[in-house]
């Protein structure tokens, strides 16, 4: 994860808007470290923000943040919640591993500190809006966002916004109950209800949950998460992924002239985002468990953009 | 935490009914399907049969098909289990359970039915 | 309908040992659809075992299940004194559920 470019100029003014400004204290002055007697955006408005376009999705580890100084009083965002979005229109408060409250940030304690704030799970939003919720004397802003995949790929594919069609999505097996049938197609990240993902007939290494992009897709990273049922945690702790052009002839992802192995989930309802490096040209992609607890049970994202995207 | 509890114990004269209660705590009755099952004194257990609250189907064990009703009332998060015509072999403990994820992980404490003329 | 038949009938065993309990179906299944219960007398049935071996949330690792197709074992590697009950085996799935009759394990 590197800076996003706040502090570099990289993310232009434009990019930077804001509800509102104290004077001359700007959105586009927002950023990490700046300098000058007025050398940050500032607000003297109770319910305020400040919104980040990075022009296409990222996925965005964590923020710096900062205050600044006016004469001898300091300015900075004590507690702070974030909204991302992928369009603009539909936000969504940052929740963490909650499903139900919203995450409050600790922000800043002075004027001059960087307090480091990580988003675990990451986000992947074209747009970040942050809601300062307790500041001293105004809400005054100098920050970073980190994060990756400046070159725009790392857009999700479909798999949690059902672009990718159940009939897309396929499995060596699948478990039913009475009520209950957790088919490949349930296999979609944050999805909710009764049987809200892949599980397997039977859980060995030799079962696979494949997806069809339908065409030849650059795919730069997957996301995982498992699922639980009232008491009990079920998730994939490694897997292997591999990929075809035909659907036939399959090729595991190697890193360094051996089979990779992904670190998968730690719990439940994490989302745990791999990179893959180097990216995959693939039309099919299929995830292998080798390792889990109590069940094999799978949520996934697939992230990339299309190869002609590229050129 | 996740409680079924269900309701006292039932004498009844044989060919009258019981309906059995199963009140679920710490989720929605609707999340999970409920089960029903039966133990005769000093026996072993029997499955009666499952109802989904969710679809309001359910699936009844053959040997109680035609005497036993499932329903549920989502508004208070209670299942029941009607048992009609009743005969002395039907005296027994009967537990609901439901699934977590795929077996019975979580019972009622039984509800002890006594049918005796 | 799959029968269960369970063997044997009665254990006696003392704590510390080791107890192996079978499960034999009438015609094959998935092991998917297995799982194992322990009862105490008063008490509700205690899932032990699903998946034919997995261990339920909170069961200790001397209970180990195993097996396929027809025969399931259940297996408990050291007795302690409250493992001594009544244990029964069970075919879940997406029709009828079946119990076997039940093992009833007993301090010798």
């Known amino acids: 994860q590197t800076p996003l470019g706040m502090a570099s100029g990289h993310i232009r003014d434009f990019q930077i808007t804001a509800s509102g400004q104290y004077g001359q204290w700007a959105p586009k002055l927002a950023r990490l470290h700046y300098s000058g007697s007025i050398n940050a955006w500032s607000t003297k408005e109770p319910f305020s923000w400040i919104k980040v376009d990075l022009l296409a999705p990222m996925i965005i580890h964590g923020i710096k943040t900062q205050g600044a100084r006016q004469k001898f009083s300091s300015l900075y965002i004590s507690q702070f919640i974030i909204m991302y979005s992928l369009d603009g229109k539909k936000w969504q408060t940052y929740r963490g591993n909650s499903t139900g409250t919203l995450m409050v940030f600790f922000g800043n304690v002075d004027s001059s500190g960087i307090k480091h704030n990580i988003f675990n799970p990451p986000i992947i939003a074209r747009y970040i809006r942050l809601h300062p919720t307790h500041y001293s004397i105004r809400s005054t802003l100098r920050m970073e966002l980190m994060g990756c995949d400046l070159n725009s790929c790392s857009m999700p594919l479909g798999m949690e916004s059902k672009a990718i069609s159940d009939a897309q999505i396929t499995a060596s097996s699948y478990f039913t109950n009475m009520f209950a049938t957790w088919s490949p197609s349930k296999a979609r990240l944050h999805l909710q209800g009764r049987s809200n993902a892949w599980r397997p007939q039977v859980n060995n290494p030799k079962e696979w949950l494949q997806v069809d992009f339908q065409k030849t897709m650059k795919v730069t990273g997957v996301t995982t998460q498992g699922v639980k049922s009232l008491l009990t945690s079920m998730y994939v702790k490694e897997f292997l992924i591999s990929s075809s052009q035909d659907g036939h002839q399959w090729t595991l992802f190697f890193q360094n002239g051996k089979v990779k192995v992904f670190q998968g989930n730690q719990d439940s309802f994490t989302p745990v985002v791999n990179s893959l490096d180097p990216p995959l040209l693939t039309r099919y992609l299929r995830i292998h468990p080798q390792s889990w607890v109590h069940q094999i049970a799978l949520r996934m994202e697939v992230l990339g953009c299309e190869a002609q995207d590229l050129y | 935490q996740v409680q079924l509890v269900q309701s006292g114990a039932e004498v009844k004269k044989p060919g009258a009914s019981v309906k059995v209660s199963c009140k679920v705590s710490g989720y929605t009755l609707t999340e999970l399907p409920v089960h029903w099952v039966g133990q005769a004194p000093g026996k072993g257990l029997e499955w009666v049969g499952s109802?989904?609250?969710?679809?309001?189907?359910?699936i009844y064990a053959r040997e109680f098909q035609g005497s036993v009703t499932m329903t549920a009332d989502t508004s208070t998060d209670i299942a029941y289990m009607e048992l009609s015509s009743l005969r002395s072999d039907d005296t027994a403990v009967y537990y609901c359970?439901?699934?977590?994820?795929?077996?019975?992980?979580?019972w009622g404490q039984g509800t002890m039915v006594t049918v005796s003329s | 309908e799959i029968a269960l038949t369970q063997s044997p009938g009665t254990l006696s065993l003392s704590p510390g040992e080791r107890a192996t309990l079978s499960c034999r179906a009438s015609?094959?299944?998935?092991?998917?659809?297995l799982a194992w219960y322990q009862q105490k007398p008063g008490q509700a049935p205690r899932l032990l075992i699903y998946?034919?071996?997995t261990r339920a949330t909170g069961i200790p690792d001397r209970f180990s299940g195993s097996g396929s197709g027809t025969d399931f074992t259940l297996t408990i590697s050291r007795l302690e004194p409250e493992d001594f009950a009544v244990y029964y085996c069970q075919k879940y799935g997406t029709s009828a559920i079946t119990f076997g009759q039940g093992t009833r394990l007993e301090i010798k």
């Open positions: 015609q094959s299944f998935s092991s998917s659809y």
């Open positions: 998946g034919a071996s």
């Open positions: 109802f989904d609250p969710e679809s309001g189907e359910s």
């Open positions: 359970a439901v699934p977590d994820p795929d077996a019975f992980d979580i």
